[in-house]
Structure formats: C-alpha cells, structure tokens
Amino acid sequence: YDFTNCDFEKIKAAYLSTISKDLITYMSGTKSTEFNNTVSCSNRPHCLTEIQSLTFNPTAGCASLAKEMFAMKTKAALAIWCPGYSETQINATQAMKKRRKRKVTTNKCLEQVSQLQGLWRRFNRPLLKQQ
C-alpha cells in the first residue's frame, strides 16, 4: 500500500491522543529500555510503511502484536485516514487469522515495540534531518 495520500495530521492526532499511551503502557516497567533503534524512516509515507510492517507482520520471536490495543488503534487510524487502505488489508487479515497461535510475549516483542515508538516519533517530526 502507498501511504502518500494519507491525512498525516489526523493520524498524528490519533497517535498523540491514544496510540502513544498504549505503546508506553506496553513498555512500562521493562528493564530493557535501551534497545538500539535499528529501523528508521525518511518521510511520513515511509514511516507509515515501516510502522505497518512492524505492527502487523509477524516476525520471528514475536507473532502477537496485531492483537494489542495500540495495533488495533493504528489499524483504525490507517483505515480512516488512508484512502483505500482497508481494502488492501482484507486478504492479509484472513491469512493472519489462519496463522494465529497462543500469544506468548518475549523480549523480541518488547524490542519491536521500542522500534515502533521510534518510528512514530520520527513520523511526528517529518522536517528533522535523518541522523
């Protein structure tokens, strides 16, 4: 999906009002707060592409993020503020339902959510030069 035509300010507002709280909640109390940010993005469409991938695509060691509250709110924001996004997700969602297993949270999930926090922060500061 091409995120170029999304309403970025509306998505930013959704992030600031709710999604950010849920990400902080997920990470709260965690000792491993100093994860290295290995995923970066260069502009808002690119950031949303990376956010979508990390949030909804199961990875080795962390298959469970799509059911988290921050993920559901992310999905809702993208569906509302990115034209045509919902249609592209129907097949992906059906495929994921077939793969879903018992949720087990590991350090890999915590690391992944830490990466997501970095991507969202970058999304909110699009004019900053890439470090």
Partner: antibody, heavy 120, light 109 residues
Framework: EVQLVESGGVVVQPGGSLRLSCAAS????????MHWVRQAPGKGLEWVSL????????YYADSVKGRFTISRDNSKNSLYMQMNSLRTEDSALYYC?????????????WGQGTTVTVSS | SSELTQDPAVSVALGQTVRITCQGD??????ASWYQQKPGQAPILVIS???NRPSGIPDRFSGSSSGNTASLTITGAQAEDEADYYC????????????FGGGTKLTVL
Amino acid sequence: EVQLVESGGVVVQPGGSLRLSCAASGFTFDDFTMHWVRQAPGKGLEWVSLISWDGGSTYYADSVKGRFTISRDNSKNSLYMQMNSLRTEDSALYYCARGPYYYFYGMDVWGQGTTVTVSS
Amino acid sequence: SSELTQDPAVSVALGQTVRITCQGDSLRTYYASWYQQKPGQAPILVISDKNNRPSGIPDRFSGSSSGNTASLTITGAQAEDEADYYCNSRDSSDNHLVVFGGGTKLTVL
C-alpha cells in the same frame, strides 16, 4: 485529595453474583489504568484484574477468568467488578487501586477495601 | 503464570539496615514495585520501577534489581517500618498480567 472508595461487598451464597464499585476522586480518572486486588483473611495480596485507561483492554487472573468482568465509566469516575459464579475461595477484602498508564503495573493509590464473604 | 518468591519473615534491629528480596523469572525482564501494609490498613506503594519513591515515602527506602532478584532496602529501620512488604511485577508468561510475591513480615527489634 486523591481518593478511592470501594463499595458493594456483602455476604453472598456460593454460585451467587455481586457487583463491586469504586468511586474515584481528586484526579483525572481517565488518565489511569485501574486494578482490583484482593486479600483473603490472614493471606497475601492477589491481583485480580485490570482495565486500561480507556477501557479498551481488560485482563484477569486465571482464578477469576470467565467469572468476573471489570468495567469502568469514565464519565462517572467509577470502576466496577461484576462477580458471577462466586466460590468460597473468592471471600476476601477487595481493593481497587490505580496504576498510571506509563507505569501500568505499579499501583500508587489504594482504596480501603470492601469485604466479600461467600458462604452458605 | 510466573511466581515471585519472598522470605516469609525478616527481622532487623532498630536503626540497622535490612534488605527484603523478591525472586522470579519475570524480574529478569521487568522491574518490581514494593508495597508496605500495616495491620488493618491498605497497602502503600513505597518503590516503583527502577527506584522511584512516591512523595511522602522516606528516603531510607530504596530499591534495586539484579538478574532475577529485586531488593527493597531500608537503611536505618524505624519502629514504624514494622509491616508486611509485598513485591509485584508484570508476569513474564503473559505481560498483561500482574503477579504478587507472597509477602515478607518485617519485625523491628
């Protein structure tokens, strides 16, 4: 003054139902996760359930899952626990406690508790 | 679910330093919180997260963590510190759940 006041604890027969309430005051209620924690007479603290700041997420200890339902009404600054299929081992002092969303699992304000007795 | 293990009872001489420990797999990943409870009273949070002391908690209370063990240290124990102390943290088997330790009864001699 930041305060939590529980109510609704009574004597009930095994298999019965009960609804506990917790009235919050002195803080912005919808900024906080809320928990129920119980303590049987002479025993330690046992976490029962939590509900996220916006009510979107609820979680339960295995011992009450499927029988208890936590909810909140942010417009009334109130937390609830619907308790069904009560067992004698549910007899305890039930506390509500608040947990900042940024420290979801630490409970920084507690009520004085309400007593639930399940007995025939 | 995970378990947190505490010594049932610990004693300390007035004015001395005592350490109360809490062990469990979840503490490798998550910080513990510590609560003080006196008879007939509700628990009070004394330490949260890394070593955060809520306002009103004396600075003789401190927290630390190493491996799978969290510790609550009271430096210069006072008579009013006699109480039950509980640790809790997120549950490592399901990080949305909460687990409490069994509690430690502290006696100040």
